[in-house]
Interface confidence: medium
């Protein structure tokens, strides 16, 4: 599923991401935009043999199990395919674990490069939340 901007903002708010670990909703929507272009079925392969999955491009070396990533830790204890569902519950739950890990949203390269220090509230402006 490819979410609309405000549709995703509403879904993320419903799942408790607004101000989760101090990160406003705009940060999460911005991250999703530049990680997956709001596409729940996005997959991207990395040079280390791992793959990033879903709307928040969660990595198979650390967070989920795709059955084929060397040394996978599967810290979210889920199959990576669950992160590709049109229901973002699994992605959100895993993202909560990632953002609590110590580096906050710096774990997402796209957030670090495209969202951090910008007017992230623009990503939810005009949305009826």
């Amino acid at each position: 599923k490819v979410f609309g901007r405000c549709e995703l903002a509403a879904a993320m708010k419903r799942h408790g991401l607004d101000n989760y670990r101090g990160y406003s909703l705009g940060n999460w929507v911005c991250a999703a935009k530049f990680e997956s272009n709001f596409n729940t079925q996005a997959t991207n392969r990395n040079t280390d043999g791992s793959t990033d999955y879903g709307i928040l491009q969660i990595n198979s070396r650390w967070w989920c199990n795709d059955g084929r990533t060397p040394g996978s830790r599967n810290l979210c204890n889920i199959p990576c395919s669950a992160l590709l569902s049109s229901d973002i519950t699994a992605s959100v739950n895993c993202a909560k674990k990632i953002v609590s890990d110590g580096n906050g949203m710096n774990a997402w390269v796209a957030w670090r490069n495209r969202c951090k220090g910008t007017d992230v509230q623009a990503w939810i402006r005009g949305c009826r939340l």
Partner: antibody
């Protein structure tokens, strides 16, 4: 136990298309990538590409883009590979395998012969 | 693409001999290298994963070693059932690639 059952041998005319199937049993089909591999005598094994049945995500070896198309039917736990515009170069044995990085589980292979 | 070069192309041995098959990668692939045996008209069979991890059910006479670019499959005291083709395969990056194979034949 994990099994991959491929469709039977095919004899096709040049220019035609063919669809090969791979039925998976014994594991959660949507969770693992299905890979496709080509084998021609004297050409070894070639990786064609892969599909993640749960999402339909696909990746193709550049060499096979436009030649192969992958689909999957999660209701029947079956992956498919369609090969188009067949030529004699496409005559080969085609395998599906479960993508664990390594390939512990293989189909028995489908022999495709392209001949006028 | 990562190229895998296997040598020798053919190895003629007598049952009871010990042999080593080589697989060389065009760039470093860490330990992401796997070995297969294939007999005529059969699907490949996984022997060794991640360079040195013998798969369940594979006899202990098969062993793998190496890291980076140079890898070896060793068969200690070859048995008649071991004759056939041997392929290496890398999973370090895409596209996945295979070596050209080594044919192990009876002398």
């Amino acid at each position: 136990q994990v099994q991959l059952q491929e469709s039977g041998a095919e004899v096709m005319k040049p220019g035609a298309s063919v669809k090969i199937s791979c039925k998976a049993t014994g594991y959660t089909f949507t969770t693992y990538w299905i890979e496709w591999v080509k084998q021609r005598p004297g050409h070894g094994l070639e990786w064609i590409g892969e599909i993640l049945p749960g999402s339909g995500s696909t990746y193709y070896n550049e060499k096979f883009k436009g030649k192969a198309t992958f689909t999957a039917d999660t209701s029947s736990n079956t992956a498919y590979m369609q090969l188009s515009s067949l030529t004699s170069e496409d005559s080969a044995v085609y395998y599906c395998a479960r993508g664990d990085g390594w390939y512990c589980y293989w189909g028995q292979g489908t022999t495709l012969t392209v001949s006028s | 693409d990562i190229e895998l070069t296997q040598s020798p192309a053919t190895l003629s041995v007598t049952p009871g001999d010990s042999v080593s098959l080589s697989c060389r990668a065009s760039q470093s692939i860490s330990n992401n290298l796997h070995w297969y045996q294939q007999k005529s008209h059969e699907s490949p069979r996984l022997l060794i994963k991640y360079a040195s991890q013998r798969v369940s059910g594979i006899p202990s006479r098969f062993s793998g070693s190496g890291s980076g670019t140079d890898f070896t499959l060793s068969i200690n005291s070859v048995e008649t059932e071991d004759f056939g083709m041997y392929f290496c395969q890398q999973s370090n990056s895409w596209p996945r690639t295979f070596g050209g194979g080594t044919k192990l034949e009876i002398k």
